[in-house]
């Protein structure tokens, strides 16, 4: 599932390159292992912003699929309460390219621990 999430992120990156979206997104670029589920939640919420701002059907479908995949992969620990983690709004705002790169890094963390 996580490998498919990375494929979807690459697809989103390719789709966005042909568009002009200037959004800045809350991005966790240095995820602590004890806050990875919280960080993933922030990434997924911000991904929905990309979908809405793009107005593109392919991006919309890919984001929706990515959320479905992540949900199923995290169904066992998605409701774990992580303490001492940053709120999404406390994270640094970065451009879409940097956001997607950081997203791939956190997904790699989940792959490495699964």
């Amino acid at each position: 599932n996580w490998v498919n999430v990375i494929s979807d992120l690459k697809k989103i990156e390719d789709l966005i390159q042909s568009m002009h979206i200037d959004a800045t997104l809350y991005t966790e670029s240095d995820v602590h292992p004890s806050c990875k589920v919280t960080a993933m939640k922030c990434f997924l919420l911000e991904l929905q912003v990309i979908s809405l701002e793009s107005g593109d059907a392919s991006i919309h479908d890919t984001v929706e699929n990515l959320i479905i995949l992540a949900n199923n992969s995290l169904s066992s620990n998605g409701n774990v309460t992580e303490s001492g983690c940053k709120e999404c709004e406390e994270l640094e705002e970065k451009n879409i390219k940097e956001f997607l790169q950081s997203f791939v890094h956190i997904v790699q963390m989940f792959i490495n621990t699964s």
Epitope: M40, K41, L52, A57, D61, E64, I68, N71, G78
Partner: antibody, heavy 122, light 112 residues
Framework: EVRLMASGGGLVQPGGSLRLSCAAS????????MSWVRQAPGKGLEWVAT????????YYPDSVKGRFTISRDNSKNTLYLQMNSLRAEDTAVYYC???????????????WGQGTLVTVSS | DVVMTQSPLSLPVTLGQPASISCRSS???????????LEWYQQRPGQSPRLLIY???NRFSGVPDRFSGSGSGTDFTLKISRVEAEDVGVYYC?????????FGQGTKLEIK
């Protein structure tokens, strides 16, 4: 008023195939994900398949995975369910339903067709 | 898979009286983004299912305000404040937070 008309049901032998159709009208079909849900005689509802707006992504329960294929033709405003290797336990009324977007709405099935009966028997 | 368990399976109610249906999931159905995709559907005799409530407590358009949804985590409830004759049928809860999406067994509401 949103309209969904399921068709294609009938009697088929075990191991046989059938293709169901669902004609959509009075809404922009390509803006919605779609699902199939079935109901065996006298039983409850069972989710069968979901397809994304553009048709790139499909989802199934294990009970039909590898045997059923959901697809769509947005130019014809039509949803399909190709059913292969049919079994007696696939006997049911099959409903098509429109899905609200997870991102912009509630991810619910807000409108349903009238259903088409599939009977698998020798 | 997430198992949805409804109770009671049969619910005889007097016209004008309240009714309550419980739905319990085998695990939390709060998804990673914090949403709970729990719906309630009504199926009148001989008819297709109809959406009543989505995301736990949101009433779908055209649904009378005597229907209300509540709950969180694993425990959910559909309430009808005053049952009317047209409410007869089977009520299903449904989760689509996690694939495979699953329905409860259904609760048959009938008039006493």
């Amino acid at each position: 008023e949103v309209r969904l008309m399921a068709s294609g049901g009938g009697l088929v032998q075990p191991g046989g195939s059938l293709r169901l159709s669902c004609a959509a009208s009075e809404f922009t079909f390509s803006n919605y994900a779609m699902s199939w849900v079935r109901q065996a005689p006298g039983k409850g509802l069972e989710w069968v398949a979901t397809i994304s707006r553009g048709g790139d992504y499909t989802y199934y329960p294990d009970s039909v995975k590898g045997r059923f294929t959901i697809s769509r033709d947005n130019s014809k405003n039509t949803l399909y369910l190709q059913m292969n290797s049919l079994r007696a336990e696939d006997t049911a009324v099959y409903y098509c339903a429109r899905r609200v977007s997870m991102i912009t709405g509630g991810w619910a099935m807000d409108y349903w067709g009238q259903g088409t009966l599939v009977t698998v028997s020798s | 898979d997430v198992v949805m368990t409804q109770s009671p399976l049969s619910l005889p109610v007097t016209l004008g009286q309240p009714a309550s249906i419980s739905c319990r999931s085998s695990q939390s159905i709060v998804d990673i983004t914090g949403n709970t995709y729990l719906e309630w559907y009504q199926q009148r005799p001989g008819q297709s299912p109809r959406l009543l409530i989505y995301k736990v407590f949101n009433r779908f358009s055209g649904v009378p305000d005597r229907f209300s949804g509540s709950g969180s985590g694993t425990d959910f409830t559909l309430k009808i404040s005053r049952v009317e004759a047209e409410d007869v049928g089977v009520y299903y809860c449904f989760q689509d937070s996690f694939v495979p999406y699953t329905f409860g067994q259904g609760t048959k509401l009938e008039i006493k």
